[in-house]
């Protein structure tokens, strides 16, 4: 019998207010197993996938989205979806990314604290959480 | 059809160096974390080290037993992954296998390195 | 670092057998677990991961199970290509640590 796949989470750092030119990460986290990560914009036909999958938490795996310099392009609502086979979950909650213009450098700390959006809280890092890799190819139309 | 494909091995003097190649087909090599596992002979499996995706900052890991002497490293425009080690040991005789992550679920066929004066 | 402790290390059995392999963790790693077969010459297949999940290919006489520090392979029913050396491996934190091996021969 397959299992009920519980909806994914997804979250920003350093947060989901974000400085025209610096850099955003998105998180998506679900269950032990996940082999494919999908990260979609409010049209599911933009996505972008990530096979590297890393532990969390003993329960919980994890994937990292990276935009490295956000523009006003990137402004916007996201979610996660994941592949743990033999079937796809559900989207979490959907995150909005929302990009000022700013009169400080790149790096200047005015970012919310990291935001989250879905079922389950983040858990807090630990020692362990070098943030590990999963499987499968898919293709993607890439978000940035 | 997912394909590893090592190749670099062979025959080496203590203290020398070696480099590794796998050429990854029949997946999308950039978006999955990458291993190096090991087996000497006669011997168990040793994770030797990993490499992370550009959403990881390449981020790579090592056993204690070769870090500061080996390093992994990806081409993603080649679909290579590599493994450059140097101040060769005796006790790094061993086939090197590359695999890919987090599962290790694809594993090449291997390629024999001797260390050995 | 993470121990994994297999055992046993070698086993004799005989076809249609039931075969149970376990794998103890020096501390828990949830169900960040992974099977392999390895046969002479031959490089590791995966059979299990996450503790319990088939693989694409293998065969459901193999099955997982265990979380937290406990964990255990089982063939229920050994055909003659089952022979071989298996290892587990933890994924939860790098080392990425493989147990010693447990060979399964022809009793």
């Known amino acids: 019998q397959e299992e009920d796949l519980p909806r994914p989470s997804i979250s920003a750092e350093p947060g989901t207010v974000i400085p025209l030119g610096s850099h955003v990460t998105f998180v998506c986290r679900g269950p032990v197993g996940v082999q494919t990560f999908r990260l979609e914009r409010e049209s599911r036909s933009t996505y972008n996938d990530t096979e590297d999958v890393s532990q969390a938490s003993p329960s919980e795996s994890e994937a990292r989205f990276r935009i490295d310099s956000v523009s006003e392009g990137n402004a916007g609502p996201y979610r996660c979806i994941y592949y743990k086979p033999p079937k796809w979950s559900e989207q979490s909650d959907y995150l909005e990314l929302l990009v000022k213009e700013t009169s400080g450098g790149p790096d200047s700390p005015d970012t919310e604290p990291g935001s989250s959006a879905g079922p389950t809280q983040r858990p807090s890092d630990n020692s362990h959480n070098e943030h590990a890799p999963a499987s499968q190819g898919l293709k993607a139309e890439h978000l940035y | 059809e997912v394909q590893l494909v090592e190749s670099g091995g062979g025959l080496v003097k203590p203290g020398g160096s070696l480099r590794l190649s796998c050429a990854a087909s029949g997946f999308t090599f950039n978006i999955n974390a990458m291993n190096w596992v090991r087996q000497a002979p006669g011997k168990g499996l040793e994770w030797v080290a990993r490499?992370?995706?550009?959403?990881?900052?390449?981020?790579?890991y090592y056993a204690d037993s070769v870090k500061d002497r080996f390093t992994i490293s990806r081409d993603d425009s080649k679909n290579t992954l590599y493994l450059q080690m140097n101040s060769l040991k005796t006790e790094d005789t061993a086939v090197y296998y590359c695999?890919?992550?987090?599962?290790?679920?694809?594993w090449g066929q291997g390629t024999l390195v001797t260390v050995s004066s | 670092d993470i121990q994994m402790t297999q055992s046993p290390s070698s086993l004799s059995a005989s076809v249609g057998d039931r075969v149970t392999i376990t794998c103890l963790a020096s501390?828990?790693?949830?169900?960040?677990l992974a099977w392999y077969q390895q046969k002479p010459g031959k490089a590791p297949k995966l059979l299990i991961y996450?503790?319990?999940s088939l693989a694409d290919g293998v065969p459901s006489r193999f099955s997982g199970s265990g979380s937290g520090t406990d964990f255990t392979l089982t063939i229920s029913s050994l055909q003659p290509e089952d022979f071989a050396t298996y290892y587990c491996q933890q994924l939860y934190s790098t080392p990425y640590t493989f147990g010693g091996g447990t060979k399964v021969e022809i009793k």
């Open positions: 501390q828990t790693i949830g169900t960040w």
């Open positions: 695999v890919r992550g987090p599962y290790f679920d694809y």
């Open positions: 490499i992370r995706t550009k959403n990881n900052n390449f981020a790579t």
């Open positions: 996450a503790a319990t």
